[in-house]
């Protein structure tokens, strides 16, 4: 297994990720963002929610 | 493949304004910032600004403030710098560089020529 | 903005010569620093980034290293082919250049 060396973004990056941390995946030349609960995308930009099914009138 | 193509070379007046384009294949620039930078013939490179194409943010080196404008249309994968009140320093090549989702990615650069 | 001081201007060296370029922050940029290569009519080639972390495809023979405000970019052995200008950039806060090191050879 390769080990990906990581650090924190640089101050340049401010901002980039909207709503999770922005790590920076020195082997790889990248910035990525790690999203929050609940968010998606390249920068963490999508909202999605989860819908959970309702209880059926046979489980009541 | 991933591609930067950035518009023609350029000739203006003194006085005038030049607008560079620069457009994205094979990515969203949305994902990324698109920088700007610029080298006068015979001399260095010289960062001028910055913006995030998802939220519109620009940020612009001191010395070109007020006389440079960065936009993007995330429409059409679009950036583009516009530079006014040109003068005869500010003959160079202008190159449009991604960052973000890879370490600068360079377009291959637009002469702009300002010469009376 | 963060100052980007880069020396010497120029230097001359023969083949297999080593190499040192170094560049001065004015304040801490954190190792956010990443140096490249441009030879005439061509585009930078980005060769180090993150202080010391060679690019998929460069030589061996290019180094990079330091921290706070002191980086050296360093050719162990220099070649023929390494002819061209070479420019620091610090990315910890917006972007700054080094004026650049013409390198030639004797």
């Known amino acids: 297994v390769a080990q990906v060396s990581i650090t924190k973004c640089s101050s340049d990056m401010n901002g980039y990720c909207l709503h999770g941390q922005c790590i920076y995946l020195v082997d790889m030349s990248q910035n990525y963002c790690r999203c929050e609960v609940g968010y998606t995308g390249v920068r963490c930009e999508h909202f999605f929610l989860t819908v959970h099914q309702p209880l059926s009138k046979e489980y009541v | 493949q991933d591609q930067l193509v950035q518009s023609g070379a350029e000739v203006k007046k003194p006085g005038a304004s030049v607008k560079v384009s620069c457009k994205a294949s094979?990515?969203?620039?949305?994902?990324?910032?698109i920088q700007w930078v610029r080298q006068a013939p015979g001399q260095g490179l010289e960062w001028m600004g910055r913006?995030?194409?998802?939220?519109?943010?620009?940020k612009y080196r001191e010395k070109f403030e007020g006389r440079v404008t960065i936009t993007a249309d995330t429409s059409t994968n679009t950036a583009y710098m516009e530079l006014s009140s040109l003068r005869s320093e500010d003959t160079a090549v202008y190159y449009c560089?991604?960052?973000?989702?890879?370490?600068?990615?360079w377009g291959q650069g637009t002469l702009v020529t300002v010469s009376s | 903005d963060i100052q980007m001081t880069q020396s010497p201007s120029s230097l001359s060296a023969s083949v297999g010569d080593r190499v040192t370029i170094t560049c001065k922050a004015s304040q801490d940029i954190h190792k956010y620093i990443a140096w490249y290569q441009q030879k005439p009519g061509q585009a930078p080639r980005l060769l180090i980034q993150y202080t010391s972390t060679l690019q998929p495809g460069v030589p061996s023979r290019f180094s990079g290293s330091g921290s706070g405000t002191d980086y050296t970019f360093t050719i162990s052995s220099l070649q023929p082919e390494d002819i061209a200008t070479y420019y620091c950039?610090?990315?910890?806060?917006?972007?700054?250049f080094g004026g650049g090191t013409k390198v030639e050879i004797k």
């Open positions: 913006i995030d194409p998802l939220r519109g943010n620009t």
């Open positions: 950039l610090q990315y910890d806060n917006r972007r700054t």
């Open positions: 560089v991604r960052s973000g989702t890879l370490f600068d990615f």
């Open positions: 094979g990515f969203n620039i949305k994902d990324t910032y």
